[in-house]
């Protein structure tokens, strides 16, 4: 969550409605929206905690 992490990557959409789901009742095929990297290549958008939440439903 620092501005130095800003890079040119595809838009990352924040997921809605987080609850503590029971594992067996919750199945979603998440697709990764950007390539693996670490630290300086991290996503930075104006969405909440976008640097930690990168998977789109």
């Amino acid at each position: 969550p620092i501005s130095a992490f800003a890079v040119d990557i595809p838009e990352i959409h924040e997921r809605e409605g987080y609850e503590d789901e029971i594992d067996d009742e919750y199945e979603v095929d998440w697709s990764n929206s950007s390539s693996a990297t670490s630290g300086s290549g991290a996503p930075s958008t104006d969405k909440e905690k976008s640097w930690l939440y990168t998977l789109d439903p």
Epitope: I2, W30, N32, S38, D46, K47, K49, S50, Y53
Partner: antibody, heavy 120, light 112 residues
Framework: EVQLVESGGDLVKPGGSLKLSCAAS????????MSWVRQTPEKRLEWVAS????????YYPDNVKGRFTISRDSAKKSLYLQMSHLKSEDTAMYYC?????????????WGTGTTVTVSS | DVLMTQTPLSLPVSLGDQASISCRSS???????????LEWYLQKPGQSPKLLIY???NRFSGVPDRFSGSGSGTDFTLKISRVEAEDLGVYYC?????????FGGGTKLEIK
């Protein structure tokens, strides 16, 4: 019930390596970012590492960067912390923590911790 | 790094009193997305820390309404309106706006 159970803590010599594990249950593991937080013998809390929900992005403070590696295995619902080139100042209780989600707190669930002692 | 300074180090209170803990950051912890990721945790004796407050003033699920958080920019406060025995322990503030994330040194709430 949401639960995090750490294991792998041990007494290790300076320069040694150790891998901590955290078994998660009671929530959809792949939906949440995860972190390791440690508590020094002086009771100070220090953030150690974080990993994004899908595992693609990792974050570390400078004092562990290059020595520690956080990773996750969604199939096993497990979080890991590989620690190498350990120093005496890494001696601490290590907690596995769950993030609350994009709009919530960073560490909304904590494990009971596992003790790492670095000493010759 | 953002230094988080808590005062007082120790806070002796009588049960039923109001308690106030201050946390000051060495720089603004307003994130570029507009949010302030300031949190409060309580560690009771022999237990792991627990989340109380997130984003300055939001109570975590199950946290009694006698706990309230306030502040902005660099100055933040946790207030406990009527201290109960179960509130005793060490309180830590935390900022998650700038890497490295950092905790305050802790404030021990104890019986006077």
């Amino acid at each position: 019930e949401v639960q995090l159970v750490e294991s792998g803590g041990d007494l290790v010599k300076p320069g040694g390596s150790l891998k901590l594990s955290c078994a998660a249950s009671g929530f959809t593991f792949s939906n949440y970012a995860m972190s390791w937080v440690r508590q020094t013998p002086e009771k100070r809390l220090e953030w150690v590492a974080s990993i994004s929900d899908g595992g693609s992005y990792t974050y570390y403070p400078d004092n562990v960067k290059g020595r520690f590696t956080i990773s996750r295995d969604s199939a096993k619902k497990s979080l890991y912390l590989q620690m190498s080139h350990l120093k005496s100042e890494d001696t601490a209780m290590y907690y596995c923590t769950k993030d609350g989600g994009p709009r919530e707190g960073y560490f909304d669930v904590w494990g009971t911790g596992t003790t790492v002692t670095v000493s010759s | 790094d953002v230094l988080m300074t808590q005062t007082p180090l120790s806070l002796p209170v009588s049960l039923g009193d109001q308690a106030s803990i201050s946390c000051r950051s060495s720089q603004s912890i307003v994130h570029s997305n507009g949010n302030t990721y300031l949190e409060w945790y309580l560690q009771k004796p022999g237990q792991s820390p627990k989340l109380l407050i997130y984003k300055v003033s939001n109570r975590f699920s199950g946290v009694p309404d006698r706990f309230s958080g306030s502040g902005s920019g660099t100055d933040f406060t946790l207030k406990i309106s009527r201290v109960e025995a179960e509130d005793l322990g060490v309180y830590y503030c935390f900022q998650g706006s700038h890497v490295p994330y950092t905790f305050g040194g802790g404030t021990k709430l104890e019986i006077k």
